[in-house]
């Protein structure tokens, strides 16, 4: 059981993917400090010339839903949504390879940015991933 | 040099459209959040809009939603206020600022003059 | 949308004055508030952000606080160039809204 709460993504980088949908957030004054994080990690992605088109057309929104993941509605307590462990696998090992190797080795990005571990997320036919996150 | 430089302002009829321009210079343009804020004559600082041009997001303020919109060109470093339907109550010195997170307006442009009258 | 409620609207002091100016929040915004000078016919200046960060370049004479959802502005000792209007914002959740102003006049 998670102690967090649920509330309305309030911010703005984020807002084109997100909207004004519920997100799960471990404390109540804990957006303003991600949206900062995830400010400036895009702005650390923004300026290095590693991020090809492909993936980032995937990549920014996927990390946009893992900063600020949309709450579970279907639970009696606050709960974040999973992004989904497929799509999460096609990201990291597909799409995004070449900036996931660059991403893990530079201490810069992962100073500012949590990567997904696609590992931690449940597989794609169990209970737990019926409402995962799509892209 | 940070600079933001507005344009576009001007006498327009009620119910007319009118664009702003803010063209950034000396700064990342797609790493700032940029924003129009507005002041009527005499009156307070009024948020308008803004845009995140890394990821084409947006926000306004509930008074102008439906009617302006705002946009970015990151090629030509220059955000837009496209202002439709407009009314009296929009008169007002309309001007751009950036931000970066939540740590405040920390540039601002000169501001452009915006009269709807008729 | 979040209120800001600044208070005087206006008041009068002299220089070397201690000025304090604040601002209530209608909900709780953490410690997300700036503060801006402005003077007639030009645009606004950031003076504080983060409730109580002193921005770049601004004299120390200048500071800001936070009590709950209480923002205060303090000018130590009034300087003639202090004689202006302004504003707290609140950097929390959009729409971002901004206080009424309060104008600071030569007694």
């Known amino acids: 059981e998670e102690d967090g709460f649920c509330q309305p993504y309030r911010g703005i980088a984020c807002a084109r993917f997100i909207g004004n949908r519920t997100v799960y957030m471990e404390s109540l004054h804990m957006q303003g400090e991600i949206e900062n994080q995830i400010t400036a990690a895009f702005t650390m992605i923004g300026t290095s010339s590693h991020l090809s088109d492909k993936c980032s057309q995937f990549a920014i929104p996927s990390l946009c839903h893992y900063a600020f993941p949309y709450c579970d509605e279907t639970s009696s307590v606050p709960k974040p949504r999973d992004l989904c462990r497929d799509e999460c696998e096609i990201l990291e090992n597909v799409l995004c390879q070449t900036e996931y190797i660059f991403a893990r080795s530079n201490p810069m990005i992962l100073m500012r940015l949590k990567l997904p571990n696609c590992e931690d997320l449940p597989q794609p036919e169990s209970p737990e991933a019926a409402n995962c996150i799509r892209i | 040099e940070v600079q933001l430089v507005e344009s576009g302002g001007g006498l327009v009829q009620p119910g007319g459209s009118l664009r702003l321009s803010c063209a950034a210079s000396?700064?990342?343009?797609?790493?700032?959040?940029i924003h129009w804020v507005r002041q009527a004559p005499g009156k307070g600082l009024e948020w308008v809009a803004a845009?995140?041009?890394?990821?084409?997001?947006?926000q306004y303020a509930d008074s102008v939603k439906g009617r302006f919109t705002i946009s970015a060109d990151t090629s030509k470093n220059t955000a837009y206020l496209q202002m439709n339907s407009l009314r009296a109550e929009d008169t007002a010195v309309y001007y751009c600022?950036?931000?970066?997170?939540?740590?405040?307006?920390?540039?601002w442009g000169q501001g452009t003059l915006v009269t709807v009258s008729s | 949308d979040i209120q800001m409620t600044q208070s005087p609207s206006s008041l009068s002091a002299s220089v070397g004055d201690r000025v304090t100016i604040t601002c209530r929040a209608s909900?709780?915004?953490?410690?997300?508030v700036a503060w801006y000078q402005q003077k007639p016919g030009k645009a606004p200046k950031l003076l504080i952000y983060?409730?109580?960060s002193l921005y770049s370049g601004v004299p120390s004479r200048f500071s800001g606080s936070r009590s709950g959802t209480d923002f205060t502005l303090t000018i130590s000792s009034l300087q003639p160039e202090d004689f202006a209007t302004y504003y707290c914002?609140?950097?929390?959740?959009?729409?971002?809204?901004f206080g009424q102003g309060t104008k600071v006049e030569i007694k």
């Open positions: 600022a950036r931000s970066y997170g939540t740590g405040g307006f920390d540039y």
């Open positions: 000396g700064f990342t343009f797609s790493s700032y959040v």
């Open positions: 845009i995140y041009p890394y990821t084409s997001s947006t």
């Open positions: 909900q709780s915004v953490s410690s997300a």
């Open positions: 983060s409730a109580s």
């Open positions: 914002q609140q950097w929390y959740s959009y729409p971002l809204t």
